[in-house]
Interface confidence: low
């Protein structure tokens, strides 16, 4: 067999090629360490595979922060997360890295972030209205379009990594520990993302994936929200995960995908995949979720959950889908468009960031170069808008 057919991202393909090496060469990045003594841990918020997370106080200004103490992993991985957070700092709905410190005794590195008063997603998602789902999905897309425009794939999009302060309608995309710089033609590790949100490309071991992986994960989130089924694809392991997907999207399109990219399927799938027809999305609608489902929601979902990563909507394309027309119109009317430095969407509460009625960022950061939807920089910063300038 001649090996898999190469694939390149449809958008933002060469953004890292057009940036100086120090932008993406995280291994050479020199970390500037802050003072751990500035922070006092208050309580543990949670723990993950790679870190423990605490609420803390910055004693120099009495502000609440979140401190992520990293477990011992390769220095390279830590540097990657730091460099990505620094590159994305100020982007719309991107969690803001405030400081990087080391525990003076253990010498363990810790990342200090802005504080978000998060509502547990399992509780929150059960209370969201149709408009809320559209609103928050649009906010996630602002973050994704921005990071993609900056040449970065998140690779772990899932509800746990989306912090929502529902009272202030503020959303942040967090946990950039698995994120990676996109270089066309590069083969990446498929052991990324959480099982229920892994794209088919990961499950069939296709390594030349790109930003579109995040769009699959987003599609899984959307499906779970509008159908009130969490998770939507509930596999027991990575193999079963593909089976669950195939039971919805069908095996015919799966084999078309495999053929298109000349992918060699793991023999373990032979006995478990079977043959399944493609299901209509309407089949998942019932009395408890029908108020969240609309023709445009199903059309949007259908354009995200595609086997072929090149066929999925890009984040920018997604933002222009009719599913978001009401949100875009409201943000334009109320004056919002998430802006760069932390930017929260305008809604009821605070207008933390923004340019106001333009659903496309650009804050005079450069006052010269604010990308249109991408997000952010004001007055003068050449960050491409979405499909834009630097491709």
């Amino acid at each position: 067999m001649s090996g898999p057919v190469p694939s390149r991202a449809r958008v933002y393909t060469d953004v890292n090629t057009h940036r100086p090496r120090e932008y993406w060469d995280y291994e050479s990045h020199v970390v500037e360490w802050g003072n751990q003594d500035d922070y006092q841990l208050v309580r543990k918020l949670g723990r993950g595979k790679y870190s423990e997370v605490f609420e803390a106080i910055n004693i120099t200004n009495n502000e609440k922060v979140v401190v992520k103490i990293l477990k011992p992993v390769k220095k390279k991985k830590i540097k990657r997360e730091i460099k990505i957070l620094e590159n994305l700092r100020g982007g719309p709905n991107i969690i803001t890295l405030a400081d990087i410190v080391k525990d003076p005794v253990s010498r363990t590195p810790a990342l200090v972030f802005e504080h978000v008063n998060n509502t547990d997603f399992k509780q929150l998602y059960q209370t969201l209205t149709d408009y809320d789902i559209r609103f928050y999905m649009y906010e996630i897309l602002k973050a994704l379009d921005y990071c993609h425009s900056m040449g970065i794939m998140h690779r772990d999009v899932k509800p746990h990594n989306v912090m929502i302060d529902h009272e202030h309608r503020k959303l942040r995309l967090i946990d950039w520990g698995l994120a990676e710089f996109y270089h066309p033609g590069q083969e990446y590790n498929v052991r990324v993302a959480s099982r229920y949100f892994k794209g088919p490309e990961l499950l069939v071991d296709y390594q030349m994936y790109d930003y579109s992986l995040d769009m699959w994960s987003l599609g899984c989130m959307l499906a779970s929200m509008i159908f009130r089924k969490e998770p939507f694809f509930h596999g027991h392991d990575n193999y079963d995960q593909l089976v669950r997907i195939a039971k919805v999207l069908g095996t015919e399109d799966l084999y078309d995908y495999i053929d298109k990219y000349n992918i060699e399927l793991d023999p373990r799938f032979n006995d478990i995949l079977g043959r399944h027809s493609r299901k209509r999305w309407e089949r998942f609608v019932h009395s408890e979720n029908q108020h969240l489902v609309s023709p445009e929601a199903l059309d949007f979902l259908d354009k995200l959950l595609r086997y072929d990563h090149q066929s999925r909507l890009t984040a920018r394309e997604a933002m222009e889908h009719p599913y978001f027309y009401t949100v875009v119109k409201d943000q334009a009317r109320m004056g919002s468009s998430s802006m760069p430095g932390g930017s929260t969407p305008v809604s009821s509460a605070n207008m933390m960031s923004g340019i106001s009625s333009v659903p496309t960022p650009s804050p005079l950061g450069p006052l010269a170069g604010s990308p249109v939807i991408a997000a952010a920089n004001p007055l003068g910063m050449p960050v491409p808008a979405a499909a834009g300038a630097q491709q």
Partner: antibody, heavy 111, light 107 residues
Framework: QVQLQQSGAELVRPGASVTLSCKAS????????MHWVKQTPVHGLEWIGV????????AYNQKFRGKAILTADKSSSTAYMELRSLTSEDSAVYYC????WGTGTTVTVSS | DIQMTQSPSSLSASLGERVSLTCRAS??????LNWLQQEPDGTIKRLIY???SLDSGVPKRFSGSRSGSDYSLTISSLESEDFVDYYC?????????FGGGTKLEIK
């Protein structure tokens, strides 16, 4: 090379209107928002508002709402700002800024 | 609106000297601050975005930093072309606002 070429200086009468133009070249016009900024010796730099050339969406500083109207013509990659009901307070240099800063247009309001 | 208080309003310094200009924000703006340079002919360009990131083509002698609500632009060793006007801009909260400017003059 990336450029924002602004229209020439304007001398206008009080009460009149004037339209300033800003022609973009060297980048994709619809990919970057276009901001407008006013500069005077008294008030320094003031942000007027922003236009998304792709959608026509606008946002204004409350102070300039009704004073400035932002529009764009995608076919010619040109952004426009119309200033209405001019008074001496509107005498200033006006900059457009998208991918870079424009060259600036001086507006003088005088009878 | 957020007030950006820039100091000093003018500064005399010598070639090769290290200088710092400061902007203080009246509200929290995170890292959403840029530094702009204006030539005598009115030409404006951005030097620093997001508090500390250097725009491409800007000499390394320029740097940006933050301490609480104070944001600084530092020029490590002044060159003749640096004696112009500088402004900060916050873009965290609508409407965007600028500092009053600093005129850097040669001593």
């Amino acid at each position: 090379q990336v450029q924002l070429q602004q229209s020439g200086a304007e001398l206008v009468r009080p009460g009149a209107s004037v339209t300033l133009s800003c022609k973009a070249s060297g980048y994709k016009f619809t990919d970057y928002q276009m901001h407008w900024v006013k500069q005077t010796p008294v008030h320094g730099l003031e942000w007027i508002g922003v236009l998304d050339p792709g959608t026509g969406g606008t946002a204004y500083n409350q102070k300039f709402r009704g004073k400035a109207i932002l529009t764009a013509d995608k076919s010619s990659s040109t952004a426009y700002m119309e200033l209405r009901s001019l008074t001496s307070e509107d005498s200033a240099v006006y900059y457009c800024t998208g991918f870079v800063w424009g060259t600036g247009t001086t507006v003088t309001v005088s009878s | 609106d957020i007030q950006m208080t820039q100091s000093p309003s003018s500064l005399s310094a010598s070639l090769g000297e290290r200088v710092s200009l400061t902007c203080r924000a009246s509200q929290d703006i995170g890292s959403s601050l840029n530094w702009l340079q204006q030539e005598p002919d009115g030409t404006i360009k951005r030097l620093i975005y997001a508090t500390s990131s250097l725009d491409s083509g800007v000499p390394k002698r320029f740097s940006g930093s933050r301490s609480g609500s104070d944001y600084s632009l530092t020029i490590s060793s002044l060159e003749s072309e640096d004696f112009v006007d500088y402004y900060c801009l916050q873009y965290a909260i609508f409407p965007y606002t600028f500092g009053g400017g600093t005129k850097l003059e040669i001593k």
